[in-house]
Interface confidence: low
């Protein structure tokens, strides 16, 4: 893979003045064996509010790969397999923690970041807004 | 709040031998202003596969509070407002990163942990298994 050069401005791991800094062991304790959302279930295809999963990759972030859900339809799939626009497919969002390399490209220095990701979609009764 | 005494076995922040350890700045860069899932949307109530949100708290984890979704019904709500058992409400799960104090109660030492949380529910067409 691409080797990103070390940023000369990276703080020393032992810098006590690094603000609100803690030591984090990256040997992840993983309680889950299945990390690919497409394999974990086929709900994205079987749902009445189906979604596609998009790969979002960023080498400056840990985890570098995040899967983002995008609803396939504005409406929901009815019993006949057609899109029913009386209902709405909406993304279910989750706020997650990621580690952002800061300063950029530093191998041993990160900042915690909260990002909002769409995990999947659900079918809801709509609140009707007029398109202005 | 409760002050947890410092564990005398906590590693020193400057310990170079701490395995695969990085510095993490806990001044979170938060792109999202709304952190209460109940306030961010009312999808959990309006969904055809509604869910309840349960507060899961653990002072040894960061974030200490995680909201877990539990589907209200086995089936989905139909147009008449009744539960239709020809469809299934299922949880949408997301693998998230948390920080676990390690050793316990240490203020400056964590291990990354991946946990699976249920974010919300979606309505799916069931896979019918024949009883052999």
């Amino acid at each position: 893979g691409i080797t990103i050069p070390r940023n000369p401005g990276c703080p020393n791991s032992e810098d006590k003045n690094f603000p609100r800094t803690v030591m984090v062991n990256l040997n992840i304790h993983n309680r889950n064996t299945n990390t690919n959302p497409k394999r974990s279930s086929d709900y994205y295809n079987r749902s009445t509010s189906p979604w596609n999963l998009h790969r979002n990759e960023d080498p400056e972030r840990y985890p570098s790969v995040i899967w983002e859900a995008k609803c396939r339809h504005l409406g929901c799939i009815n019993a006949d397999g057609n899109v029913d626009y009386h209902m709405n497919s909406v993304p279910i969002q989750q706020e997650i923690l990621v580690l952002r390399r800061e300063p950029p490209h530093c191998p041993n220095s990160f900042r915690l970041e909260k990002i909002l990701v769409s995990v999947g979609c659900t079918c809801v009764t709509p609140i009707v807004h007029h398109v202005a | 709040g409760i002050t947890i005494p410092r564990n005398p076995g906590c590693p020193n922040s400057e310990d170079k031998n701490f395995p695969r350890t990085v510095m993490v700045n806990l001044n979170i860069h938060n792109r999202n202003t709304n952190t209460n899932p109940k306030r961010s949307s009312d999808y959990y109530n309006r969904s055809t596969s509604p869910w309840n949100l349960h507060r899961n708290e653990d002072p040894e984890r960061y974030p200490s509070v995680i909201w877990e979704a539990k589907c209200r019904h086995l089936g989905c709500i139909n147009a008449d407002g009744n539960v239709d058992y020809h469809m299934n409400s299922v949880p949408i799960q997301q693998e998230i990163l948390v920080l676990r104090r390690e050793p316990p109660h240490c203020p400056n030492s964590f291990r990354l942990e991946k946990i699976l949380v249920s974010v919300g529910c979606t309505c799916v067409t069931p896979i019918v298994h024949h009883v052999a």
């Epitope: 596609n52 998009h54 983002e68 504005l74 409406g75 909002l116 990701v117 | -």
Partner: antibody
């Protein structure tokens, strides 16, 4: 009522930079993906870039990838487009748009003119 | 990237019906929504059809949209034409990471 007001356009030399802003009002800004679409004089519409409601995901047309950066400040209800290494072919009216869903521009601003010329 | 092809121009008399076509070069049109935008001279575009055939409130029912999967094309039909319908019309669709507009069709109401 949904209102989108673009600003920041003007005349710039090739290779120069410009930052467009789009002030939004009349809706919950952070709940909507936003897009920039441009229109060269006498030509058709061309999608430029889009950003998710949280700002976590961004998308670019191949013609601007690596030169333009879309961003948003949800606390200020403002969308931005940072344009670097500008070329003559970037000359256009730039519209910001509120997306109904990904790829569906429901409401549009009135546009701001960007002219790249020496 | 795929392309969306529209006729350069169409013309029809007031009171008549006109149809503007939009053909997708690759990728199934049925998998992604098609939108139609109207742009009058000197004004910003406005959406007249979204999600293939949905009409925003305020858009007359004279405007309708449809898709034909067999020809991988979409159509905008305007019935009972009025002089105020004279404008440029753009179809638009998308895929996983980009949004594409058709080249535009100039509608002249004779």
């Amino acid at each position: 009522e949904v209102q989108l007001l673009e600003s920041g356009g003007g005349l710039v030399q090739p290779g120069g930079s410009l930052r467009l802003s789009c002030a939004a009002s009349g809706f919950t800004f952070s709940s909507y993906a936003m897009s920039w679409v441009r229109q060269a004089p006498g030509k058709g519409l061309e999608w430029v870039s889009a950003i998710s409601g949280s700002g976590g995901s961004t998308y670019y047309a191949d013609s601007v990838k690596g030169r333009f950066t879309i961003s948003r400040d949800n606390s200020k209800n403002t969308l931005y487009l940072q344009m670097n290494s500008l070329r003559a072919e970037d000359t256009a009216v730039y519209y910001c748009a509120r997306d109904l869903i990904w790829g569906v521009a429901g409401s549009w601003g009135q546009g701001t003119m960007v002219t790249v010329s020496s | 990237n795929f392309m969306l092809t529209q006729p350069h121009s169409v013309s029809e008399s007031p009171g008549k019906t006109v149809t503007i076509s939009c053909t997708r070069s690759s990728g199934s049109l049925a998998n992604y929504y098609v939108q139609w935008y109207q742009q009058r001279p000197g004004s910003a575009p406005t959406i007249v059809i979204f999600a293939n055939n949905q009409r925003p409130s305020g858009v007359p029912d004279r405007f309708s949209g449809s898709i034909d999967s067999s020809s991988n094309s979409a159509s905008l039909t305007i019935s009972r034409l009025k002089t105020e319908d004279e404008a440029d019309y753009y179809c638009q669709s998308y895929d996983d990471s980009s949004v594409v507009f058709g080249g535009g069709t100039k509608l002249t109401v004779l």
